[in-house]
């Protein structure tokens, strides 16, 4: 069945997304499968449902089990299952395999380690990073947004990296940690001045007022692993984070590599409930690497 494994540590926050995705307007009901008991939506509960998300604030070992989410459209009900396991905190430094997220590989040119699942949480920078339980110190390590960059990667940088951050829910803070292995590989490649594939410069996109729309900024930076390759959106020349409009959210950049070996990154700007004032903004797609910065501008117009 449509099922997803999720895990966490006791006394930490855990947020799980329903594996059955639907449109944002669809209702999502959550149940504890063993008892068929409905999960409450009131935020005063330690475990509560919030649309597509199931929140354990904080999690307890007894929360382990299978949770059912039913996504309801006007004519279809679709079911997903979240298999949740909450573990006791380890007394020593060792992080067991069952608490590890997917392994990532890096090279001298590309040493980004993303903090797993962080996009589900309401967190603020900076992240804390640990390698084999030791806090990372020194200028080689740069905590940037939701990832860690290591300068001049060497083979002994391989190991288990843990990110630690604070999730905030209605003024209360909860700790979250996530660990993944990092391996180092030797890779031949090259980097170029960024090439923006989309949008075209000075493009205009037609949108419906009141509807949702997505803008994709897609750029390529060369072949093979890239040391620095950033794709982001700006609004009227300002960072999205500085633009206090919760309807407009930028997704974490998704790495993409094509059959021709080009290393590209896509970053999506999601605009919910498009308003007239959004048509007045200038949307800049920025692609930056060590060679320089390229900018393409797109504007919105009413359909």
């Amino acid at each position: 069945k449509f099922s997803k494994q999720s895990w966490g540590l006791e006394n930490e926050a855990l947020i799980v997304r329903c594996p059955r995705q639907g449109k944002s307007s669809y209702i999502v009901d959550w149940y504890y499968s063993q008892t068929n008991k409905s999960i409450p939506t009131q935020e005063r509960n330690r475990v509560f449902a919030s649309g597509q998300l199931l929140k354990f604030l904080p999690a307890e070992v007894a929360d382990s089990g299978i949770y059912t989410c039913i996504v309801r459209s006007p004519t279809f009900n679709r079911t997903g299952y979240a298999n949740v396991t909450i573990y006791k905190k380890q007394p020593d430094c060792n992080v067991p395999d069952y608490l590890m997220y997917s392994t990532v590989s890096g090279s001298e040119k590309n040493s980004k380690i993303y903090c797993p699942t962080i996009d589900l949480y309401n967190w603020t920078a900076p992240l804390e990073w640990f390698k084999n339980c030791q806090a990372l110190q020194g200028s080689r390590y740069k905590a940037h947004k939701s990832f860690l960059v290591i300068d001049n990667v060497m083979t002994d940088d391989a190991g288990d990296y843990t990110c630690k951050f604070i999730h905030n829910e209605n003024g209360a803070n909860y700790s979250v940690t996530a660990t993944r292995s990092f391996t180092v590989k030797d890779e031949q490649g090259f980097s170029l001045f960024p090439v923006i594939r989309a949008p075209a410069h000075n493009e205009t996109k037609e949108v419906e007022i009141g509807e949702n729309t997505n803008l994709t900024c897609s750029a390529c930076f060369g072949k093979g692993a890239q040391f620095l390759a950033t794709v982001q959106w700006q609004l009227n020349g300002n960072k999205i984070t500085d633009f206090s409009e919760p309807r407009i959210q930028q997704e974490e950049g998704q790495n993409q590599s094509f059959s021709n070996g080009l290393a590209c990154v896509n970053t999506v700007l999601r605009i919910a409930d498009v308003k007239e004032e959004d048509l007045l903004l200038r949307y800049d797609c920025l692609a930056l690497n060590l060679h320089g910065l390229r900018r393409h501008t797109i504007r919105l117009s009413r359909k």
């Epitope: 069945k1 449509f2 639907g22 459209s73 004519t75 279809f76 679709r78 509807e211 729309t213 997505n214």
Partner: antibody, heavy 123, light 106 residues
Framework: EVQLLESGGGLVQPGGSLRLSCAAS????????MIWVRQAPGKGLEWVSY????????YYADSVKGRFTISRDNSKNTLYLQMNSLRAEDTAVYYC????????????????WGQGTLVTVSS | EIVLTQSPATLSLSPGERATLSCRAS??????LAWYQQKPGQAPRLLIY???NRATGIPARFSGSGSGTDFTLTISSLEPEDFAVYYC????????FGQGTKVEIK
């Protein structure tokens, strides 16, 4: 009531072009992905092309890639299929159908279908 | 692409009998599988989605089961209007249809 009505089929010579239309009513057209499916005479169903609700995502079956173009005009509640470089094996009844769930770029079932329009490619 | 193989190609049964139709996928499609009914000169009609859920207005005699690569459509007691061609469709990776099973009157 949801209704889909295809038009634009007919007889065309190999190498020729045809544009199919599908007029939709009874639902918020821009909310849903739309799909073209075809059925050669006496044969099974073959998926042809997909377009997301806002028109930003399109997919094609390998058999039509580079020759067919799917598009939509949400202001007119109309779906299109531009068919170029037509071949004898494109002869089929072409159905437009609604994918009522699909988030942009994903697929689901087809809950409403048009009655189909026949395309015959022959010299 | 994911290939769906339906069996048997033809099923000859009498009204009131139980019909069991099979659909096998070349790789796992989780439960992203649907069943359709098509009568001559008509467009297909959705019966089952997500392998086992009946679409709105579909009689209870139609049921679906399976997950992964092996799926079954069961018609518990055939009515005269059930004699038609049945197609399975996967939507896990793009869309593909099976080649169809014809249920005909014996």
């Amino acid at each position: 009531e949801v209704q889909l009505l295809e038009s634009g089929g007919g007889l065309v010579q190999p190498g020729g072009s045809l544009r199919l239309s599908c007029a939709a009513s009874g639902f918020t057209f821009s909310d849903d992905a739309m799909i073209w499916v075809r059925q050669a005479p006496g044969k099974g169903l073959e998926w042809v092309s997909y377009i997301g609700g806002n028109g930003g995502t399109t997919y094609y079956a390998d058999s039509v890639k580079g020759r067919f173009t799917i598009s939509r005009d949400n202001s007119k509640n109309t779906l299109y299929l531009q068919m170029n470089s037509l071949r004898a094996e494109d002869t089929a009844v072409y159905y437009c159908a609604r994918d009522p769930w699909s988030t942009e770029g994903s697929f689901f079932v087809l809950d409403y279908w048009g009655q189909g329009t026949l395309v015959t490619v022959s010299s | 692409e994911i290939v769906l193989t339906q069996s048997p190609a033809t099923l000859s049964l009498s009204p009131g009998e139980r019909a069991t139709l099979s659909c096998r996928a070349s790789q796992s499609v989780d439960d992203d599988l649907a069943w359709y009914q098509q009568k001559p000169g008509q467009a297909p009609r959705l019966l089952i989605y997500d392998a086992s859920n009946r679409a709105t207005g579909i009689p209870a005699r139609f049921s679906g089961s399976g997950s992964g690569t092996d799926f079954t459509l069961t018609i518990s007691s055939l009515e005269p209007e059930d004699f038609a061609v049945y197609y399975c469709q996967q939507y896990n990776d793009a869309i593909t249809f099976g080649q169809g099973t014809k249920v005909e009157i014996k």
